[in-house]
């Protein structure tokens, strides 16, 4: 039961995390205009990975996409790549984990297969989360660097008379969404990996003896096989019957249809 809960919770947490990563990637507020230096601005600038926007005090917002690939900073391209890799890995992980869920029965899938799939999805979620955290962190670092560079030459004199205020950018909401979402995906992945340990059936300690007419061999028949998960021994001992894939945990009544909720 604990395994099912851990696996289910891991799936849900990862699902929320990946949804957050997608949201963060699509959001326009990766960097927002720092209003500390000009709190009375009637024009507010903010930028995303895909476009930059200007919101006027009139309420009108104009967004322009970055319609070039070559002209964009390498760091921005790297952040885009990390976020996309995170989304793709996360999406594949979700797909894999759906079939690995203990509460869903698909044909006569063995526990070992489910354990492997759970581990695979868990690793994918961990990498996905790390990609998102890395992407957001790279962007944040880029912002901090640019912020202090623009602070250093905040005012550039025009003819020694007129002052032009340089627009500085600070952390936007998308960064915080990305960090939280990446963290959730990472946690969900760890939970899936932990659940995998409980899913993997142990080799049983008893032997099934078969007698033959020739009377010369004693066959050792394992009740199941132990999946190579890389983890230590299971905390919960599970007996398997007839060498089949069903454990005691599965001897509950299941709904007639697969429950994907």
């Amino acid at each position: 039961m604990a395994v099912t809960a851990c696996q289910g919770l891991g799936f849900v947490v990862s699902l929320i995390g990946i949804a957050g990563i997608i949201a963060a990637t699509c959001m326009d507020q990766w960097s927002t205009q720092d209003l500390y230096n000009n709190p009375v601005t009637a024009v507010f600038n903010y930028q995303g990975l895909w476009r930059s926007c200007v919101r006027e005090s009139s309420g009108f917002t104009e967004c322009r996409g970055y319609f070039t690939l070559l002209g964009l900073p390498a760091m921005l391209q790297a952040v885009r790549a990390l976020m996309i890799v995170g989304i793709v890995l996360g999406a594949i992980g979700l797909l894999v984990s759906i079939f690995a869920l203990k509460c869903i029965r698909i044909g006569s899938m063995e526990d070992s297969a489910k354990a492997n799939m759970t581990l695979t999805s868990g690793i994918m979620f961990i990498v996905s989360g790390l990609c998102a955290i890395a992407g957001v962190s790279v962007f944040a670092n880029m912002l901090v660097t640019n912020f202090w560079m623009s602070t250093a030459n905040m005012y550039t004199g025009m003819g020694g008379m007129v002052q032009t205020v340089q627009t500085r950018y600070t952390f936007g909401a998308a960064l915080f969404v990305g960090w939280v979402a990446g963290g959730l995906t990472l946690i969900g992945g760890v939970m899936m990996c932990i659940a995998c340990r409980g899913l993997a059936p142990e080799e049983t300690n008893y032997k099934a003896v078969s007698y033959h007419a020739s009377g010369h061999s004693v066959a050792y028949k394992p009740g199941g096989f132990k999946a190579s998960t890389g983890f230590g021994s299971n905390t919960k001992n599970k007996k398997t019957y007839d060498g089949g894939a069903h454990t005691e945990d599965e001897l509950q009544s299941y709904p007639s249809k697969h429950d994907y909720v």
Epitope: V43, S52, V54, E56, S58, T164
Partner: antibody, heavy 118, light 113 residues
């Protein structure tokens, strides 16, 4: 057709208050911010502040803060400006204007003339 | 506050002439986010409210005759009337739309001979 209809002229005593209105028609009132501008006789234009009818959130020019109060009523599509502690310096024509793209005031009311005299 | 300085304060021209009036701001009105200058030009005829002519320094408001042209960037702006008509008799104001408080220039009074 977009129209901003302002209330009639006011003759008030020094120290008194005056409340003028600006009724909007021909567009969705909550979609545009309403600004107020002061013009003294034979002089230039001075920005007082604005009211966002959607949020009822005002913003004031520091010079008029505390004396000007901007409000709006969605049900009647009307913006209001109340001016308190009036002096002769407040004798002017007060315009309401709709803010559009580019932060430009594209439609203006005909103006409310306020005369402060004892 | 951004100070808007208009010059000249008044102009007297004959119909058909080309007219240029200037507006200078104490701070740049160029927004880096969209590379637009937040400067607006208004025309105020005697006894009337101001009328929007040009916004974003050079974008003509719909219905405004094409003889009116706005130009400039950063801190220096110009309003040009290519061929002045009798109905152009008015005071022309430039306005900072970039930061609060919105500030207006003192105006340029255009008179026709």
């Amino acid at each position: 057709e977009v129209q901003l209809q302002e209330s009639g002229p006011e003759l008030v005593k020094p120290g008194a208050s005056v409340k003028m209105s600006c009724k909007a028609s021909g567009y969705t009132f909550t979609n545009y911010i309403i600004h107020w501008v002061k013009q003294k006789p034979g002089q230039g234009l001075e920005w007082i502040g604005y009211i966002n009818p959607y949020t009822d959130g005002p913003k004031y020019n520091e010079k008029f803060k505390g004396r000007a109060t901007l409000t709006s009523d969605k049900s009647s599509s009307t913006a209001y400006m109340e001016f308190s502690s009036l002096t002769s310096e407040d004798s002017a024509v007060y315009y309401c204007a709709r803010l559009n793209r580019g932060n430009a005031m594209d439609y203006w009311g005909q103006g409310t003339s306020v005369t402060v005299s004892s | 506050d951004i100070v808007m300085t208009q010059s000249p304060s008044s102009l007297t021209v004959t119909a058909g002439e080309k007219v240029t009036m200037n507006c200078k701001s104490s701070q740049s009105l160029l927004n880096s986010g969209n590379q637009k200058n937040y400067l607006t030009w208004y025309q105020q005829k005697p006894g009337q409210p101001p009328k929007l002519l040009i916004y974003w320094a050079s974008t003509r408001e719909s219905g405004v005759p094409d003889r009116f042209t706005g130009s400039g960037s950063g801190t220096d702006f110009t309003l040009t009337i290519s061929s002045v008509q009798a109905e152009d008799l008015a005071v022309y104001y430039c306005q900072n739309d970039y930061s609060f408080p919105f500030t207006f220039g003192s105006g340029t009074k255009l008179e026709i001979k």
